[in-house]
Amino acid sequence: AITEAREEAKPYPLFPGPFPGSLQTDHTPLLSLPHASGYQPALMFSPTQPGRPHTGNVAIPQVTSVESKPLPPLAFKHTVGHIILSEHKGVKFNCSISVPNIYQDTTISWWKDGKELLGAHHAITQFYPDDEVTAIIASFSITSVQRSDNGSYICKMKINNEEIVSDPIYIEVQGLPHFTKQPESMNVTRNTAFNLTCQAVGPPEPVNIFWVQNSSRVNEQPEKSPSVLTVPGLTEMAVFSCEAHNDKGLTVSKGVQINIKAIPSPPTEVSIRNSTAHSILISWVPGFDGYSPFRNCSIQVKEADPLSNGSVMIFNTSALPHLYQIKQLQALANYSIGVSCMNEIGWSAVSPWILASTTEGAPSVAPLNVTVFLNESSDNVDIRWMKPPTKQQDGELVGYRISHVWQSAGISKELLEEVGQNGSRARISVQVHNATCTVRIAAVTRGGVGPFSDPVKIFIPAHGWVDYAPSSTPAPGNADPVLII
C-alpha cells in the first residue's frame, strides 16, 4: 500500500484557527511552535491583541499556584492527509487528541463524507491517562479496501457541547478502471448514424478508451474517458464493446449488439375466441417485431361466400392487447380473417387466413300487416299477421311472441304468448271488458326475439267483467287463451 503524506511538516499556530465544521473561534494568539511538538504551554505570557498597546509596568500580584503542566490544544493532532492504496489492500489510520482529565466520558466518532460510520467498522479508541491529561488515539482500519471506501474521513469529539473536528484524511483506493457508463444495446435504422458512450473512472486517472467492433479496434489512438463513438451507419448487425485503460491495467465493457430495424414478421396463431351473430372476437400471437416496437395492427375480413363481391373490410387497432372484436358482421355468415401488424419500418405480411362464422341472429324485422278484431260471440280477440321477409342470415323461424296489454280504469296488465312458426293467426280470450287491448307481435329464431311490430289497439266494450287472477296464467274455467286458427 502506498501511503502519501501531502502535508509538509510546517509550523502551525499554538492555537490554530477554527476547524472546518467546528464552532467558530477567534482571537488566535500569535505564538507558533513546530508541528512535531507535543504539549503546548498554556499561556506562558499574555499575547496582546493586534493593534492594542501592551499594558506595561502593572503591579500584578504574584501567582501562588503554578500549573503543573501546560494544557494541550483543544484540537486533533495533525496526521497524514492523503493515503493512496490499491484495491483489496489493508489500511489503518488514526486521530489523536489530548484531553484534560476533567473531561471524562469523551468519545470520538468517525465520519466519512459527512455521514457517521456506525456499526460494523473496525474503529478502536485507546486511552493513555497521565496525571492531568489523557491522550486519546482513535484508530480506524479497513482490512480489504474497496472503491466504495474512497472518501474523506474525519474524527469528531464533543467537549462542553461543542464539536471538535479533525483535519480530513483522504483515502484514495486505486484499481482497474471502473465503468460508470457502458455502451447500451440499440436497434437502429439501416444506414443511419448513431452514438455509443463509454465512461470509466480510476483512480488512478487518466482512463483511456478504445472502441471495439466485432472484435476489431475501431480507433487507433485512445480517447480520454468519457468517449462517444459516432457510427455512420450499419447494414447488418454488429457487436461493440469498449476497453478502459489506466496505470493499473485494462477493463473491458460488456459487448452490446446493435440490431438493424426491419419490417415485422406476420402474426401467428390467429384464433377465434368468441362468436355472436354480428361479431367475432379474435386473438393473435405477434410475430418478431423487427427490432422496432409494434405500432398498430390491421384486421382484414373477407366474406367467404363464393357469390360475394370479394370486398375486404379493414379494421385498425392498437398493437396491444393482441385481441380485437370485429363488429357489424352479418349473422350466419362465413368470413376469412387475416392480421397484419406494423412498426416504424413498415407493415408485416398478413398472417395465415382463418375461417370463422357468425351465429344465428334474431330476426331483423317484425311481422307485417298485424290486424286485430273482436269475436263477440266467442268472447275472443282474433289476431292476424304476415310472416316477415326472412333473410337467410337471421336464422330459421321458430315461432312468434305476442304481447297483449289490457288497460282499464287505471289497471294495466301485460300478457305474453308464444305461437308456433307455422301459423299466421292467433286467438286470445278477452281478459277485461270496457278496456283497451294493445297487441304487438315479434318473430323468434334460435338467435333470439326480433323487434316487435307497431302496436295495434282494439276497444273491448262493456259486456260485463271477465274474472281473472292477477297473474299471467288464464282464469279458472277458461280454455287456453291462445288459439291458432
Epitope: 499556530p13 499554538l14 492555537f15 490554530p16 484557527g17 464552532l23 467558530q24 473561534t25 477567534d26 482571537h27 488566535t28 494568539p29 498554556a42 499561556l43 499574555s46 499556584s65 500549573e67 503543573s68 494544557l71 490544544p73 483543544l74 484540537a75 484534560p100 476533567i102 473531561y103 464533543k158 467537549i159 462542553n160 457541547n161 461543542e162 464539536e163
Partner: antibody, heavy 123, light 107 residues
C-alpha cells in the same frame, strides 16, 4: 452589529410554566453555542445550561435539570428556554449569552449577552 | 463542582485610585476564567477572557492576571463609569460557576 434580543417581562402563577426567547442577529446563529444565566435580585449569576444550535445538543447545570428546557429554531435564529413548575425561587432575570472559545484552547467566555427577561412568579 | 470565591464582596474607592479584585478557584482551572462588569439594571459585559486577554473595546486600564487557582482583575486609575459589580466565571469542566461578585462603589 451582534445582538441578542430577549422577550419581555413575564408574570406567572406558581406551578405554571413559561417559555422565553432570545433572538440572535448580526452573526451566523449556528456558529456559536447559546448559554442561559439566572440572576436573582441582588444576587450573583448562575449558569443554567447551554445548547448547540447545530444539533440541538444540550448540557444543563445539575441544579436546573428538570426545571429548564433549552431549544432552538435555526430558521428564525432564536433560542428558547422553558421553565416549568415555577415557584417564588424562580423569580429572577434570565439572560442568554453567546459562548465563544479562545482559539484552540479550553478557555471559553460569554462575549455577547442578551437584554434579559424578568420572570416574576406570584399568585 | 468547582467553587469560585471572589473578594472583596464590596469596595468603596475614589476616582483615580487603583483596585485589584481577587478570584480564587477551589481547584486548578488553568487559565479558563473570564471577568464581567455589570452596571445597575443592565446586562453583564465581557472584560477579560482566558484570564489575561482584554475583550474588544475594553479600556487598557483594565488588566487580568493569574492562572491555576488564583486570578486578579486590576483597574488602574478608576473612572466614574467603572463603578458597578464585577464577576469572575470559570469554564473548566462541564459546569461553569460565577464568583459571588464584587460591588465597586464611589467613596
Amino acid at each position: 452589529e451582534v445582538q441578542l434580543q430577549q422577550s419581555g417581562p413575564e408574570l406567572v402563577k406558581p406551578g405554571a410554566s413559561v417559555k422565553i426567547f432570545c433572538k440572535a442577529s448580526g452573526y451566523t446563529f449556528t456558529a456559536y453555542n447559546m448559554d442561559w444565566v439566572k440572576q436573582s435580585h441582588g444576587k450573583s449569576l448562575e449558569w443554567i445550561g447551554d445548547i448547540n444550535p447545530n444539533n440541538g445538543g444540550t448540557i444543563y447545570n445539575q441544579k436546573f435539570k428538570g426545571k429548564a428546557t433549552l431549544t432552538v429554531d435555526k430558521s428564525s435564529s432564536t433560542a428558547y428556554m422553558e421553565l416549568r413548575s415555577l415557584t417564588s425561587e424562580d423569580t429572577a432575570v434570565y439572560y442568554c449569552a453567546r459562548r465563544r472559545r479562545y482559539g484552540n484552547t479550553y478557555y471559553w467566555y460569554f462575549d455577547v449577552w442578551g437584554t434579559g427577561t424578568t420572570v416574576t412568579v406570584s399568585s | 463542582d468547582i467553587q469560585m470565591t471572589q473578594s472583596p464582596a464590596s469596595l468603596s474607592v475614589s476616582v483615580g485610585e487603583t483596585v485589584t479584585i481577587t478570584c480564587r478557584a477551589s481547584e486548578n482551572i488553568y487559565s479558563s476564567l473570564a471577568w464581567y462588569q455589570q452596571k445597575q439594571g443592565k446586562s453583564p459585559q465581557l472584560l477579560v477572557y482566558a484570564a489575561t486577554n482584554l475583550a474588544d473595546g475594553v479600556p487598557s486600564r483594565f488588566s487580568g492576571s493569574g492562572s491555576g487557582t488564583q486570578f486578579y482583575l486590576k483597574i488602574n486609575g478608576l473612572q466614574s463609569e467603572d463603578f458597578g459589580s464585577y464577576y469572575c466565571q470559570h469554564f473548566w469542566g462541564t459546569s461553569y460557576t460565577f464568583g459571588g461578585g464584587t460591588k465597586l462603589e464611589i467613596k
